[in-house]
Amino acid sequence: SEEPPISLDLTFHLLREVLEMARAEQLAQQAHSNRKLMEIIGK
């Protein structure tokens, strides 16, 4: 049986949210790696 439209809307909102959180975490990790690299180069 099909889900009601409201629940469909939210499931796709949640998927988008998950993707955005993953992207933000990836960027944060990249920034952290860059800082570590700069510390090593700076020494």
């Epitope: 939210l10 998927l15 955005e20 959180m21």
Partner: antibody, heavy 115, light 112 residues
Framework: EVQLVESGGGLVQPGGSLRLSCAAS????????MSWVRQAPGKGLEWVAN????????YYVDSVKGRFTISRDNAKNSLYLQMNSLRAEDTAVYYC??????WGWGQGTLVTVSS | DIVMTHSPLSLPVTPGDPASISCRSS???????????LDWYLQKPGQSPQLLIY???NRASGVPDRFSGSGSGTDFTLKFIRVEAEDVGVYYC?????????FGQGTKLEIK
């Protein structure tokens, strides 16, 4: 660091009103759905309501529909829950949370409905 | 509304041992996108809840890899490779397939 700080709880008589607030920081508030979840003393968690980034959509559990209103002010990084016609069964700690998946939670504010 | 049911409701464990918690939903949480709309939360004593697992099997940021989520449709499991003393608290599953989102009644994990 993500921070959510609830306020506005307290003791109120049945039939009374309260407005809860949640001050958000450490993330882009206007990019996120926001939610309220409550927990009656010694009981489990109950999802109450959520609201879209631009306030164009909101959803409620049946037991609070027509009595509670979720709202937000993106300019102030704040989430609100206006609670009217309060009942004894609304007594709970109310948590605000970031997102649909409830990524982060505040410390909660206690609402006690009693005569 | 979708009803979520935990088992067991209480789980005494010995540190270092594996453990698992089950959660069953009254209807399938498998969406047409292929994702299961099931999250797991932990509420440690005296603290606010925290997200552990989202969409059935994805660990939230900072969650140790000794936790894992599995299952599909109506039957889900939260597994601990080895329980540590800091894992005590109440574990809740929540369905996010449709509003109102609903939580299970919780499983209390305690150390023997």
């Amino acid at each position: 660091e993500v921070q959510l700080v609830e306020s506005g709880g307290g003791l109120v008589q049945p039939g009374g009103s309260l407005r809860l607030s949640c001050a958000a920081s450490g993330f882009t508030f206007s990019d996120n759905w926001m939610s309220w979840v409550r927990q009656a003393p010694g009981k489990g968690l109950e999802w109450v309501a959520n609201i879209k980034q631009d306030s164009s959509e909101n959803y409620y559990v049946d037991s609070v529909k027509g009595r509670f209103t979720i709202s937000r002010d993106n300019a102030k990084n704040s989430l609100y829950l206006q609670m009217n016609s309060l009942r004894a069964e609304d007594t709970a700690v109310y948590y605000c949370s970031r997102g649909l998946a409830l990524w982060g939670w505040g410390q909660g504010t206690l609402v006690t409905v009693s005569s | 509304d979708i009803v979520m049911t935990h088992s067991p409701l209480s789980l005494p464990v010995t540190p270092g041992d594996p453990a698992s918690i089950s959660c069953r939903s009254s209807q399938s949480l498998l969406h047409s996108t292929g994702y299961n709309y099931l999250d797991w939360y932990l509420q440690k004593p005296g603290q606010s809840p925290q997200l552990l697992i989202y969409l059935g099997s994805n660990r939230a940021s900072g969650v140790p890899d000794r936790f894992s989520g599995s299952g599909s449709g109506t039957d889900f499991t939260l597994k601990f490779i080895r329980v540590e003393a800091e894992d005590v608290g109440v574990y809740y599953c929540m369905q996010a397939l449709q509003t109102p989102y609903t939580f299970g009644q919780g499983t209390k994990l305690e150390i023997k």
